[in-house]
């Protein structure tokens, strides 16, 4: 806490001065009006203050604004946005992404930190849903943004917003979430040709039910070991040596190095031994020729 | 009253280092910003570089930047300039100077006598 | 970077006239100028800072004034003590203390 002191002569501030980097805090405190401060918060981020002076500023700022600051503040905070505590950011009405933006680019290039997500979390709620330009907005400062969230918070994403979407923006989700994607995707995509539609949904394919990846197998697509790999085992077990080649194409080869990695062993335990040997890979662990397979599930259903 | 006394001049070899020191009294040390300001044979004055009273922020003509390094240490009122790499264009008077401001104002309020450094081989 | 010009170089006047010291600024200086006074084989000294403000124990006969790109040290009356080079000089963070060439005020 800055102690209350008068402020010396000559130096009560009219504006917000790059003289001011002198000031020690007690004379930031006392020679620095916080209604000037407020309105000129743009100029505060093109003087080099130090931590200890943006802490007498934040504090300046907190008396005027106890109930939260206004976003023709938050707008402008700059750097000093870093001094705030997810606390502080609670109390903020964040309704532009213009500054929401203002405020990614101070910790752009940084790992997501707690005020942040705090801020986001503020903004979204508030929207009610990811929009398109927010998604986009975010995606662009955090890839793993999309990732982070939950299945029940996806749900809220409105499929025009997955043209946002760039396939680094998915590396780190997991089957629930593109669970939650894939539908979305599928139907954000549906009036594009079969080229251009793969090229689009290739990223989301990991939340593909069976049916899904059946009919990609017929329009020659040529899916990647990479994307195959992050197929749902359960479905991609259903699929038959035939559909497999013809959904991998030129890259069916790869199967042969991936052969001990699910969802490949797991399908390839399901595959008929001389169905395999039709790749001509060398796969090994398919079911003996001359051995029933009983589909048990369906056994089931019928009793 | 307020007294500044430098010492440390000499004379160097181009490429040499020599720091300069300041014995500041009279005065709380630790509450004003310090600066160097040198002063070439019968040129006008130039300012070499300035740091603050808590050394958070130091700044540097781009003259000597990357070759001088200006320090201070509060407990023995004392400031610092280590001078790397000279060349005979840093032969001056180094004045140690005391840093004042007012709002949009900032000058130097006192000054030592200065100390001479001449870079000759 | 800004750069102050001070005119006349030398100005050579008796004792008791009036002396009218120009520094001009190559761009609008935000902040205030400070004056110096340097005698030879002294240090500067500082007369006028923040433009217009006298320094502890300058005389009245001292005076500073301008702003923007224009500044002025006037000397209502020349002492014989006030023959000497007068120094301008502002602080930016673009520019730190900037000084100008300086200008000699000799005994005609």
């Known amino acids: 806490e800055v102690e209350k002191t008068a402020c010396p002569s000559g130096k009560k501030a009219r504006e917000i001065d790059e003289s001011l980097i002198f000031y020690k805090k007690w004379e930031l405190e006392a020679c620095v009006d916080a209604a000037l401060l407020a309105t000129q918060m743009d100029r505060v981020n093109a003087i080099p203050f130090t931590y200890e002076q943006l802490d007498v500023l934040k504090h300046k700022l907190d008396e005027l604004y106890p109930q939260g600051y206004p976003e023709s503040v938050i707008q402008h905070l700059g750097y000093l946005f870093l001094k705030m505590s997810p606390e502080d950011i609670r109390k903020w009405n964040v309704t532009s992404l213009e500054t929401l933006k203002a405020l990614l680019e101070v910790n752009k290039g940084h790992e997501m930190s707690p005020q942040v997500a705090t801020l986001i979390d503020r903004f979204v709620k508030g929207r009610g849903q990811l929009d398109k330009d927010t998604l986009d907005t975010l995606t662009a400062f955090y890839p793993g943004y999309l990732c982070s969230l939950s299945p029940e918070e996806l749900s809220s994403v409105p499929p025009s917003s997955i043209w946002a979407v760039r396939p680094q923006d998915l590396d780190t989700c997991d089957p629930r979430q593109l669970d939650v994607l894939y539908p979305k995707a599928r139907l954000a995509f549906q009036n594009m040709n079969g080229s251009e539609y793969f090229v689009k949904i290739q990223s989301f394919l990991g939340g593909a039910p069976t049916e899904d990846l059946k009919a990609l197998s017929q329009q020659n697509v040529s899916m990647d070991l990479a994307t195959f790999m992050k197929l749902r085992t359960d479905a991609v077990l259903p699929l038959t040596v035939a559909e497999v080649q013809k959904l991998l194409g030129p890259h069916v080869e790869g199967l042969k190095a991936e052969e001990r990695h699910r969802p490949v062993r797991d399908w390839i335990l399901r595959q008929r031994q001389d169905d395999l040997d039709t790749l001509g890979l060398g796969l090994q662990g398919g079911i003996p020729n001359g051995y029933l397979v009983l589909d048990l599930s369906m056994q089931e259903a019928l009793s | 009253q307020v007294q500044l006394v430098e010492s440390g001049g000499g004379l160097v070899q181009p490429g040499g280092s020599l720091r300069l020191s300041c014995a500041a009294s009279?005065?709380?040390?630790?509450?004003?910003?310090m600066s160097w300001v040198r002063q070439a044979p019968g040129k006008g004055l130039e300012w070499v570089s300035a740091i603050m009273y808590d050394s958070s922020s130091t700044f540097y003509a781009d003259s000597v930047k990357g070759r001088f390094t200006i320090s201070r240490d509060n407990s023995k009122n004392t400031l610092y300039l280590q001078m790397n790499s000279l060349r005979a264009e840093d032969t001056a008077v180094y004045y140690c100077?005391?840093?004042?401001?007012?709002?949009?104002?900032?000058?130097?309020?006192?000054w030592g006598q200065g100390t001479l450094v001449t870079v000759s081989s | 970077d800004i750069v102050l010009t001070q005119s006349p170089a030398t100005l050579s006047l008796s004792p008791g006239e009036r002396a009218t010291l120009s520094c001009r600024a190559s761009?609008?200086?935000?902040?205030?100028l400070a004056w110096y006074q340097q005698k030879p084989g002294q240090a500067p000294r500082l007369l006028i800072y923040?433009?217009?403000s006298r320094a502890t124990g300058v005389p009245a006969r001292f005076s500073g004034s301008g702003s923007g790109t224009d500044f002025t040290l006037t000397i209502s009356s020349l002492e014989p003590e006030d023959f000497a080079v007068y120094y301008c000089?502002?602080?930016?963070?673009?520019?730190?203390?900037?000084f100008g060439q300086g200008t000699k005020v000799e005994i005609k």
């Open positions: 009279g005065f709380t040390f630790s509450d004003y910003a």
């Open positions: 761009q609008i200086v935000s902040g205030y």
């Open positions: 000089q502002q602080w930016s963070l673009r520019s730190p203390f900037t």
């Open positions: 923040g433009a217009s």
């Open positions: 100077a005391r840093i004042n401001y007012i709002y949009k104002g900032v000058h130097f309020d006192y």
